[in-house]
Interface confidence: medium
Amino acid sequence: MHVAQPAVVLASSRGIASFVCEYASPGKATEVRVTVLRQADSQVTEVCAATYMMGNELTFLDDSICTGTSSGNQVNLTIQGLRAMDTGLYICKVELMYPPPYYLGIGNGTQIYVIDPEPCPDSD
Amino acid sequence: MHVAQPAVVLASSRGIASFVCEYASPGKATEVRVTVLRQADSQVTEVCAATYMMGNELTFLDDSICTGTSSGNQVNLTIQGLRAMDTGLYICKVELMYPPPYYLGIGNGTQIYVIDPEPCPDSD
């Protein structure tokens, strides 16, 4: 299953990055799982994951750094709390969980660049 | 003449981006001209230019947003005062001006990403 995502995204100076993950659904899925993976220095780690019913909001864990909304075959993902050291390739993985058959699609990744802001001067 | 430069550079939160432009000199040039071009939306504009004698500092115009140093066939370029709207492909053009023959080399460009910082809160 084909998954499309932007090649590059810049995090805001507040450490927030948003991008769209779009999948070409071969069937009429009602339950979809979206996972964000980070690849840096050939290491792949899971950033966050959410399962949602088509037409409903994505529910990430309470302590997740991700939030998202879905619209049709598009998922709008937002990752927050990013620091310069979090710069890396963020890969969108989409699984159509229900009904069968199961489909899996993995995007090529979105390179997220993060720049740490300069500290504000102390207010005297 | 081959000119090498990095594919991507992030400007700091102060709007400063630095990158190295390296050229493979076919001869013993004594005078070199370096020009930085910006390509965005298929428009190419000249950002800055400097001519220097090998072994000496690069002299950009006083009001230039560029500064630089040279070491052998490498030029270390710094562009300052960048804003998010300045994000684009910055191309390094190198000309061996003297002695003859004249050589010209153009790099593939460095994509510079710039994020505007959040304003600091007013100090009361």
């Epitope: - | 013993k28 005078e31 001519t51 220097y52 004698m53 003297y98």
Partner: nanobody
């Protein structure tokens, strides 16, 4: 035989202007510069210009006041000095060299030296 001959020196009031000329015979290399020297001090680089005319260098003390230029057809270099100060008083030398990898304000970068022309600025 390469020779450099300076002219145009003299006395001027502070705030005044002078133009020095340097006539070269023969091929003098890649770079022409002006140095100056006051008694008991090292020679100091004032300004330099490349043979193509594209590259110019200036000492911080003269930036914005002095302009170096050349007329390649006449094989002559010029130093236009404006807004002159008493501290500009010195013997001015025209120099030239091949300048492969040297530094413009170092005397060792130059192969040829003129005899010098005296400039005096009075307050």
């Amino acid at each position: 035989q390469v020779q450099l001959q300076e002219s145009g020196g003299g006395s001027v009031q502070a705030g005044g202007s002078l133009t020095l000329s340097c006539a070269a015979s023969g091929y003098t290399g890649d770079l022409v510069a002006w140095f100056r020297q006051t008694p008991g001090k090292e020679r100091e680089g004032v300004a330099a210009i490349s043979r193509t005319g594209l590259t110019t260098y200036y000492a911080d003390s003269v930036k914005g006041r002095f302009t170096i230029s050349q007329d390649t057809a006449k094989n002559t270099g010029y130093l236009q000095m404006n807004s002159m100060k008493p501290e500009d008083t010195a013997m001015y030398y025209c120099v030239a060299g091949w300048h492969v990898g040297g530094t413009w304000y170092k005397t060792s970068s130059y192969d040829y030296w003129g005899q010098g022309t005296q400039v005096t600025v009075s307050s």
